[in-house]
Every structure is written in structure tokens, then in C-alpha cells.
């Protein structure tokens, strides 16, 4: 039961995280005009990965796409790439994890296959989350650098008479969405990896032994002890089968014909 819950929760958390990464990537407010010196402005600027916007006091908003590819800063291109890689990996991870979910039956898919798929999707989610966090952090670092640079040359002009106020930019909402979403995707990926451990059938040499006691039908399944311990070599009445380590819910979900004697 715990494995199913962990896997399901991991999937849901990752789904929310990837939706957040997509939202952050599409958002226009990666950087917003710093209003520290002028808290009330008639023209408000904000920028995203794909376009920059200006919202006027009148309510009119004008957005212009970055129609050049070569003219853009390398850092911006890198951030775009990281976010897109994060989305692509996350989307593939989601697709894989859907088929890996324990609650979904697809043909006669082995538990080992589901475990592998869960692990694969978990790793994809982790990388996806890291890509998003890295992308957002690179952009944030770029903003901080530019902020202090523009603060240094805040006012330029002739004889201090005419002032050209340079617009400074600070963290926009998309950065926080990106960080949270990346973190959620990362957590979801870790949960999937944890769930995978519970799903994977361990390769052991353990033997489960069924004894026929006189008068009663008793099934004995050793849990974690070596099958040979204390039971010598009396093999007359015993049925021997490979008893791979299984989780509690697997025992409940898939009753074996050897469970009852």
C-alpha cells in the first residue's frame, strides 16, 4: 500500500511541478521593473523569456517578442534551453510514469518492468527539476548582476541637469513559480525512485516452505530468515518454490496458488 501511495503521490507532485515549469516558461514576468525609487509609475516594464511587455497606467499593455535569435544574450538562450529540456524530460517522464503506476494494469506487465519504468521516470523528473531550478537560478543571477551594474550608472547626464533614469529590473513572479515548480518536480522524482525500490522484486535464493501438519493446514512462509535455518533437509512433505521479496500490497494484490495448502 505504501509503495502505491508513494508512487501515486510522486506522480501527482511531479505533474504539478511540470505544469508549474511550463507556466513559468511561458510567463512574461521573469523580470519586473524595480519600483524601489518610484513605487508608483505610469509606465511599468516587465520581461519574459520570449517577449518584453510594457503596461501603461491607462491599462494599455504592449508586448513585443524577441524576434532575433542571434542578437539575444547567450545567458537568455541558455535559460530557454534549460527550461525547454526540463519540460521535455518532464513530459516524457510523465508519459513513462503513467504506464509505471501500480494502479494501472497494462497487459501482463512484469513488476520488474514497472519498477524500471518508475525509476526511469523518477530520474527524468529529478533531471527536469534540476534543469528548471538551474534555468531560473541562472536568470536570477543575471538579474542581480545587471541590477548592481545599472545601480552604479543609475543616473547619466550632462552636468546633472538632464537625467536619464535607467530602468532596473528585479525578480519577477515567474522566478518564484519556477523555483517552486522545479523543487516539486525534484521531490516527485525522488518519491518515484523511492517507490521503485518497493516495487522491484529482489533476486534472492530464499525458499518458502509449506508444511502439512496433521489435522491442520498450516502455511509457513519465512520472512527474511534463510529457509534452511532450523529446518534441516526434510524434504518429503514440502513444496519448494522461489519466494522473492515482496511488499505487503503485492501479497494482497496477487494471491499466489502456493499461499494456501
Amino acid at each position: 500500500m505504501a509503495v502505491t501511495a508513494c508512487q501515486g503521490l510522486g506522480f501527482v507532485v511531479s505533474l504539478i511541478g511540470i505544469a508549474g515549469i511550463i507556466a513559468a516558461t511561458c510567463m512574461d514576468q521573469w523580470s519586473t521593473q524595480d519600483l524601489y525609487n518610484n513605487p508608483v509609475t505610469a509606465v511599468f516594464n516587465y520581461q519574459g523569456l520570449w517577449r518584453s511587455c510594457v503596461r501603461e497606467s491607462s491599462g494599455f499593455t504592449e508586448c513585443r517578442g524577441y524576434f532575433t535569435l542571434l542578437g539575444l544574450p547567450a545567458m537568455l538562450q541558455a535559460v530557454r534551453a534549460l527550461m525547454i529540456v526540463g519540460i521535455v524530460l518532464g513530459a516524457i517522464g510523465l508519459l513513462v510514469s503513467i504506464f509505471a503506476l501500480k494502479c494501472i494494469r497494462i497487459g501482463s506487465m512484469e513488476d520488474s518492468a514497472k519498477a524500471n519504468m518508475t525509476l526511469t521516470s523518477g530520474i527524468m523528473f529529478i533531471v527536469s527539476g534540476l534543469c528548471a531550478i538551474a534555468g531560473v537560478s541562472v536568470f536570477a543571477n543575471m538579474l542581480v548582476t545587471n541590477f548592481w551594474m545599472s545601480t552604479a550608472n543609475m543616473y547619466t547626464g550632462m552636468g546633472g541637469m538632464v537625467q536619464t533614469v535607467q530602468t532596473r529590473y528585479t525578480f519577477g513572479a515567474a522566478l518564484f513559480v519556477g523555483w517552486v515548480a522545479g523543487g516539486l518536480t525534484l521531490i516527485g522524482g525522488v518519491m518515484m525512485c523511492i517507490a521503485c525500490r518497493g516495487l522491484a522484486p529482489e533476486e534472492t535464493n530464499y525458499k518458502a516452505v509449506s508444511y502439512h501438519a496433521s489435522g491442520h493446514s498450516v502455511a509457513y512462509k519465512p520472512g527474511g530468515f534463510k529457509a534452511s535455518t532450523g529446518f534441516g533437509s526434510n524434504t518429503k512433505n514440502k513444496k519448494i518454490y522461489d519466494g522473492g521479496a515482496r511488499t505487503e500490497d503485492e501479497v494482497q494484490s496477487y494471491p499466489s496458488k502456493h499461499d494456501y495448502v
Epitope: Q33, N38, V40, T41, A42, V43, N45, Y46, Q47, S52, C53, V54, E56, S57, S58, G59, F60, E62, R64, V162, Q163, T164, V165, Q166, T167
Partner: antibody, heavy 118, light 113 residues
Framework: QVQLQQSGAELARPGASVKLSCKAS????????INWVKQKTGQGLEWIGE????????YYSEKFRGRATLTADKSSSTAYMEFRSLTSEDSAVYFC???????????WDQGTAVTVSS | DIVMTQSPSSLPVTAGEMVTMSCKSS????????????LTWYQQKPGQPPKLLIY???TRESGVPDRFTGSGSGTDFTLTISSVQAEDLAVYYC?????????FGGGTKLERK
């Protein structure tokens, strides 16, 4: 078409208050910001402040802050400007105007003349 | 506050001639976000409210004759009337529409020579 209709001329005593109204029609009232501008006879234009009818946000010129209060009534599509502690310096024509693209005031009413006299 | 200075304060003209009037701001009105200058020009005739002519320093309002042209960037702006008509005799105001408080220039009065 877009129209702004202001109340009639006002005569007030020094120290009194006046409340000017500006009724908008021909558009959705909450869509555009309304500005108020003062013009003394034979002089230039002076911005008083603006109100965003949708949320009620107001911005004032420091000179008029505290004496002018801008409000908007969405149900009647009317903007109001209340002016307190009137002096002879407040005798002027007051315009309301709609702010549009470029933060430009592109529709103006005919103006309301306020005369402060004892 | 941004101070707007218009010159000349009075401009005598004759019909058909080209006139230019100047407007200077104490701060740049150029917005880096969209590379637009937030300067507006209005025309006011006696007994009438002002009429919008030009916004974003050079964009003509619909219905405004194309003899009116706005130009300039940053802190220096110009309004040009290519061929003055009798109906153009009025006071012209420039306005900072970039920052609160919106401030107007003192006006340039276009009068018959």
C-alpha cells in the same frame, strides 16, 4: 460614441467644499482611467490626479493630495472629485478626461467652472 | 517632478508657412522597455477643452491632419505644422505622460502675424 458630461458651474465660499461629477457614456466605465485637470483662466494645464474605476486606485499630484478626493461610482458610470478647503486660488475650470494608449488624454469633457468668492 | 519647458511661448504665423515649436523635459521620457517616448501634444482653442494631437511623441491620433508631425526623443521634442491653416491658431501643450505626476509645458500660443 465616448462622451463625458460634467456637472454645472459651481460658486463656493472660501473654506467650503465642492464635489464635481463626470458622467461617462459610450463605453464600459471600468475600462478606462479617468484623469482630472485644472486650468486657471488664461493659464496652462495642471494635472490633479487619476482614478482607475475598476479597482478604485487613485494617484494624486502632491500639490493636490489631501485636498482633492477622487471617487468612482460604477453603478452610475460617474467619477467624482471633491475639493476641500477652497481658496480663491482654486477658482478655475476643471476638466475630466479619459486616459488611453500612450497615457494620453484623448476624450475631454467641456469643463466645469468653479468660482471661489466671499 | 519632471519639468516641461516649451518655447517659444508665443509664435506669430501666416497661413501656409511651416512652423516648429519645441518642448524639453528635465528627465528622459524614453521608456527602455518598448523604446517609446512618453510625450503627448495637445491643441487647445479658446473656450474649448484640449484636443489630443500626438502621443508617444510621434504617433498621430486618428482624425488629426497629417500636417501635424511630432518628433524627438529622450528630452528634446518638436511639433511641426507643415502648412499652417487658420483653424490651427490655438495654444499647444506638451505633456509628460511617462511619470507621475503628469506635467504639462507652459504652452506655445500660435497667433496671427
Amino acid at each position: 460614441q465616448v462622451q463625458l458630461q460634467q456637472s454645472g458651474a459651481e460658486l463656493a465660499r472660501p473654506g467650503a467644499s465642492v464635489k464635481l461629477s463626470c458622467k461617462a457614456s459610450g463605453y464600459t466605465f471600468t475600462s478606462y482611467v479617468i484623469n482630472w485637470v485644472k486650468q486657471k483662466t488664461g493659464q496652462g494645464l495642471e494635472w490633479i490626479g487619476e482614478i482607475h474605476p475598476r479597482g478604485g486606485n487613485t494617484y494624486y499630484s502632491e500639490k493636490f493630495r489631501g485636498r482633492a478626493t477622487l471617487t468612482a461610482d460604477k453603478s452610475s458610470s460617474t467619477a467624482y472629485m471633491e475639493f476641500r478647503s477652497l481658496t480663491s486660488e482654486d477658482s478655475a475650470v476643471y476638466f475630466c478626461a479619459i486616459l488611453r494608449r500612450g497615457n494620453a488624454m484623448d476624450y475631454w469633457d467641456q469643463g466645469t467652472a468653479v468660482t471661489v468668492s466671499s | 517632478d519632471i519639468v516641461m519647458t516649451q518655447s517659444p511661448s508665443s509664435l506669430p504665423v501666416t497661413a501656409g508657412e511651416m512652423v516648429t515649436m519645441s518642448c524639453k523635459s528635465s528627465q528622459s521620457l524614453l521608456n527602455s522597455g518598448n523604446q517609446r517616448n512618453y510625450l503627448t501634444w495637445y491643441q487647445q482653442k479658446p473656450g474649448q477643452p484640449p484636443k489630443l494631437l500626438i502621443y508617444w511623441a510621434s504617433t498621430r491620433e486618428s482624425g488629426v491632419p497629417d500636417r501635424f508631425t511630432g518628433s524627438g526623443s529622450g528630452t528634446d521634442f518638436t511639433l511641426t505644422i507643415s502648412s499652417v491653416q487658420a483653424e490651427d491658431l490655438a495654444v499647444y501643450y506638451c505633456q509628460n505622460s511617462y511619470n507621475y505626476p503628469y506635467t504639462f509645458g507652459g504652452g506655445t500660443k500660435l497667433e496671427r502675424k
